[in-house]
């Protein structure tokens, strides 16, 4: 069944990074508009992006209510200009999205090195804690707040004068590494959720930061 001259949406795809979550679909509408519904397995259908001519819908405000829930969305197609018509007894065509569990599936955004500080032969590297749109008691939570110890960071570091990389890992946002005195080092970090077994277990690498630039501070003791 379907409504005259409307085409069901297809290629429904979740795009999610650090819990900012958008549902995308095709086709670009010609004489039709869309409405999205989202539900959890224990919840019910909630309509969003009413009668939109866009082919995306930001569902972040729904999924952040419980990022460990599994969500299902569907996109309804309506003929443009007739969306409020009650004359038709036909149900508008719709397509279901794949199921989406934010905690397991949101991509990890590119991390940023907040600072590094050298004290003698040790360097403390701090990763910036990203804020998310997930809330608890009206307070926005950081990525670390949400994932806790499930989230680790891998630090790649190397002497500016060579290409041999070393790695370190932490389940906080700080590294304390040993360096050679008098050498400049470069750093890059990557966010990782080791428990994930899918392609989204790692973020892209952060921008490289090197000693001798403004982010760092060096103190010889």
């Amino acid at each position: 069944s379907g409504t005259t001259n409307t085409v069901a949406a297809y290629n429904l795809t979740w795009k999610s990074t650090n819990f900012k979550t958008i549902l995308e679909w095709e086709p670009k509408p010609i004489n039709q508009v869309y409405t999205v519904q989202i539900s959890t397995k224990s919840g019910d259908w909630k309509s969003k992006c009413f009668y939109t001519a866009d082919t995306e819908c930001d569902l972040t405000d729904e999924i952040v209510k419980d990022v460990k829930q599994t969500y299902l969305a569907r996109v309804f197609s309506y003929p443009a200009g007739h969306v409020e018509s009650t004359g038709s007894t036909e149900e508008p065509p719709y397509e279901n999205s794949p199921e989406f569990t934010p905690y397991l599936e949101t991509n990890l955004g590119q991390p940023t090195i907040q600072s590094f500080e050298q004290v003698g032969t040790k360097v403390n590297v701090t990763v910036q804690d990203e804020w998310t749109l997930v809330r608890r008691n009206d307070t926005f939570l950081s990525l670390r707040d949400v994932f806790g110890k499930d989230l680790i960071y891998t630090l790649y570091y190397w002497k500016s004068s060579s290409s041999g990389k070393k790695t370190a890992k932490t389940n906080t946002n700080e590294f304390l590494i040993d360096v050679d005195k008098g050498e400049n080092y470069c750093f890059s970090v990557q966010a990782v959720i080791p428990s994930r077994r899918t392609a989204n277990r790692k973020s892209t690498d952060s921008p490289v930061e090197c000693m001798g630039h403004e982010k760092g501070e060096s103190r010889e003791i």
């Epitope: 069944s1 539900s39 397995k41 224990s42 919840g43 019910d44 259908w45 909630k46 209510k65 036909e90 149900e91």
Partner: antibody, heavy 118, light 107 residues
Framework: QVQLVQSGAEVKKPGASVKVSCKAS????????MHWVRQAPGQGLEWMGM????????SYAQKFQGRVTLTVDTSTSTAYMELSSLRSEDTAVYYC???????????WGQGTLVTVSS | DIQETQSPSSLSASVGDRVTITCRAS??????LNWYQQKPGKAPKLLIY???RLHSGVPSRFSGSVSGTDFTLTISSLQPEDFATYFC?????????FGQGTKVEIK
């Protein structure tokens, strides 16, 4: 265990309003939607609408749009259904029922008989 | 709105009988079809959800299935406590709608 306890029977005159309460216990109130279903004497079941207690989002059957108002008080885990402009055909047992998935009513209140009579 | 047509509207059966009730939806509803039992003066009780899943605490003599657009509730061996009215209900599309009911009476 999940319990939904509704307020007592009501007798109303045509044109009046009625407000039925439904006190929930045994689960986290804001996690599950609350629906309202009515049943006229000797008749079938009719879905009226639903509310998400986490944000008070509502959805109503078109037949009741503008006449029914669903609300919640999360501090007391209580849901309310108010029906206005009552007419004799609104005489029915009104049930609150907790959702357990899209359009799935796993737990029901005991029902509240609303009689509309002049 | 989607309409469910239940058949039969009533039936007489004996204890131990196999009973089948059918519900046909006017439009596609995927597997979002639920069955409820109601006894006089009581609230409905969920028996089967998502076409064939047994709700917790419901005896295994109740089962649900689908063939094409026909959804079926089967009671394999009718017990005295099963004499009641049974409703199907679609949970796929708003507004949610119920069948008109099937009354199972003692023969």
């Amino acid at each position: 265990q999940v319990q939904l306890v509704q307020s007592g029977a009501e007798v109303k005159k045509p044109g009046a309003s009625v407000k039925v309460s439904c006190k929930a216990s045994g689960y986290t109130f804001t996690t599950y939607w609350m629906h309202w279903v009515r049943q006229a004497p000797g008749q079938g079941l009719e879905w009226m609408g639903m509310i998400d207690p986490s944000d008070s989002y509502t959805s109503y059957a078109q037949k009741f749009q503008g006449r029914v108002t669903l609300t919640v008080d999360t501090s007391t885990s209580t849901a309310y259904m108010e029906l206005s402009s009552l007419r004799s055909e609104d005489t029915a047992v009104y049930y609150c029922t907790r959702g357990s998935g899209p359009g799935l009513f796993a737990y029901w209140g005991q029902g509240t008989l609303v009689t509309v009579s002049s | 709105d989607i309409q469910e047509t239940q058949s039969p509207s009533s039936l007489s059966a004996s204890v131990g009988d196999r009973v089948t009730i059918t519900c046909r939806a006017s439009q596609g509803i995927s597997n979002y079809l639920n069955w409820y039992q109601q006894k006089p003066g009581k609230a409905p009780k969920l028996l089967i959800y998502h076409t064939s899943r047994l709700h917790s605490g419901v005896p295994s003599r109740f089962s649900g299935s689908v063939s094409g657009t026909d959804f079926t509730l089967t009671i394999s061996s009718l017990q005295p406590e099963d004499f009641a009215t049974y409703f199907c209900q679609q949970g796929n599309t708003l507004p949610y709608t119920f069948g008109q009911g099937t009354k199972v009476e003692i023969k």
